[in-house]
Amino acid sequence: ATKLTEEKYELKEGQTLDVKCDYTLEKFASSQKAWQIIRDGEMPKTLACTERPSKNSHPVQVGRIILEDYHDHGLLRVRMVNLQVEDSGLYQCVIYQPPKEPHMLFDRIRLVVTKGFSGTPGSNENSTQNVYKIPPTTTKALCPLYTSPRTVTQAPPKSTADVSTPDSEINLTNVTDIIRVPVFN
């Protein structure tokens, strides 16, 4: 069986997880992408996803999760803001490609959130200070129920709105910090 590698992030409550998952530009730029948690026994569960087709540089906020898909750079930026201890777990970025299985993007993220507030961000560039400004207006997206004829319509969380905002821009001049960890057998 294929063993998947993990990248560990240790953060404090209130901080922000900020990860970048890169993908093959030409192939997946407009594909719908998702952020999943891996439950016990290898049971991925989708927590949030981009729109379908995925829009370029268009933030999608679902609760405390913000997804931004940068087509030009072939990367999906995932932020989980105001982290809680209960957010600890194993996560992954995937690309939806029905009817095939979702395509996993590189290494998984092992998030460990501990109690206590660190006033200054640690050396990990992916941590931020406790006070984090969530963009007030972002786009919401619902994730697909694959082939069910009994599709149920989900009401999204109350914390979402419908227009994009420049507040969430990021500097992508240097994307060399994207870590590619190969899958090994």
């Epitope: 026994g41 290898e42 989708t46 949030a48 809680q84 009817p99 994730c143 694959y146 009994r150």
Partner: antibody
């Protein structure tokens, strides 16, 4: 239409094993997780475990660890739940129930009709 | 494990009148995506359970709009605006926030 059809009632002796099947139809078998839930006579619902039909991976409730085995056969879109070392307390109706694998919700939207397993000497 | 506590145990109702069932969890069921992983099921006499409400407040396909779910975190409520005779059975809440999935003890709704 979408349905889960389970195997028929079973009567077993203490110490024996039982294997209950759940055949899925009307949807893409590998796109949905399958759970097993049991209900003792006059009692509430108790979660036993889950299987991912896509890869066959499983996760069981602590209470059943070592006694339960969940498997699947993708060629027939069937999942199986085998419970060993049966005791009288295992007398119950056993249900399979599906959960959408790629959806945000973790609810069980389709249930099998149930299989009554009676453990008696 | 997350413990789910339902009340009341039994609920005698009059057709046409409202009914309310409470469900409390020992830990918050609110996930990072803003959804509460709390579902409601109805098990009619002699039948398998059926999904009524998922993610705290979303009605499943085919469920009449007299059923509604509300609440967040650890406190949830299922309301039936006007009970009908076909609504009798045992109602269960279930948390799907983390394994193992756990159910409330059930609330038996019967006609007075």
């Amino acid at each position: 239409q979408v349905q889960l059809v389970q195997s028929g009632a079973e009567v077993k002796k203490p110490g024996a094993s039982v294997k209950v099947s759940c055949k899925a139809s009307g949807y893409t078998f590998t796109s949905y997780y399958m759970h097993w839930v049991r209900q003792a006579p006059g009692q509430g619902l108790e979660w036993m475990g889950i299987i991912n039909p896509s890869g066959g991976s499983t996760s069981y409730a602590q209470k059943f660890q070592g006694r339960v085995t969940m498997t699947r056969d993708t060629s027939t879109s069937t999942v199986y739940m085998e419970l060993s070392s049966l005791r009288s307390e295992d007398t119950a109706v056993y249900y399979c129930a599906r959960e959408a694998g790629y959806d945000i919700s973790s609810a069980f939207d389709i249930w099998g009709q149930g299989t009554m397993v009676t453990v008696s000497s | 494990d997350i413990v789910m506590t339902q009340s009341p145990l039994s609920l005698p109702v009059t057709p046409g009148e409202p009914a309310s069932i409470s469900c409390r969890s020992s830990q918050s069921l609110l996930h990072s995506n803003g959804y509460n992983y709390l579902d409601w099921y109805l098990q009619k006499p002699g039948q398998s359970p059926q999904l009524l409400i998922y993610l705290g407040s979303n009605r499943a396909s085919g469920v009449p709009d007299r059923f509604s779910g509300s609440g967040s975190g650890t406190d949830f409520t299922l309301k039936i605006s006007r009970v009908e005779a076909e609504d009798v059975g045992v109602y269960y809440c279930m948390q799907a926030r983390q394994a193992p999935w756990t159910f409330g003890g059930g609330t038996k709704v019967e006609i007075k």
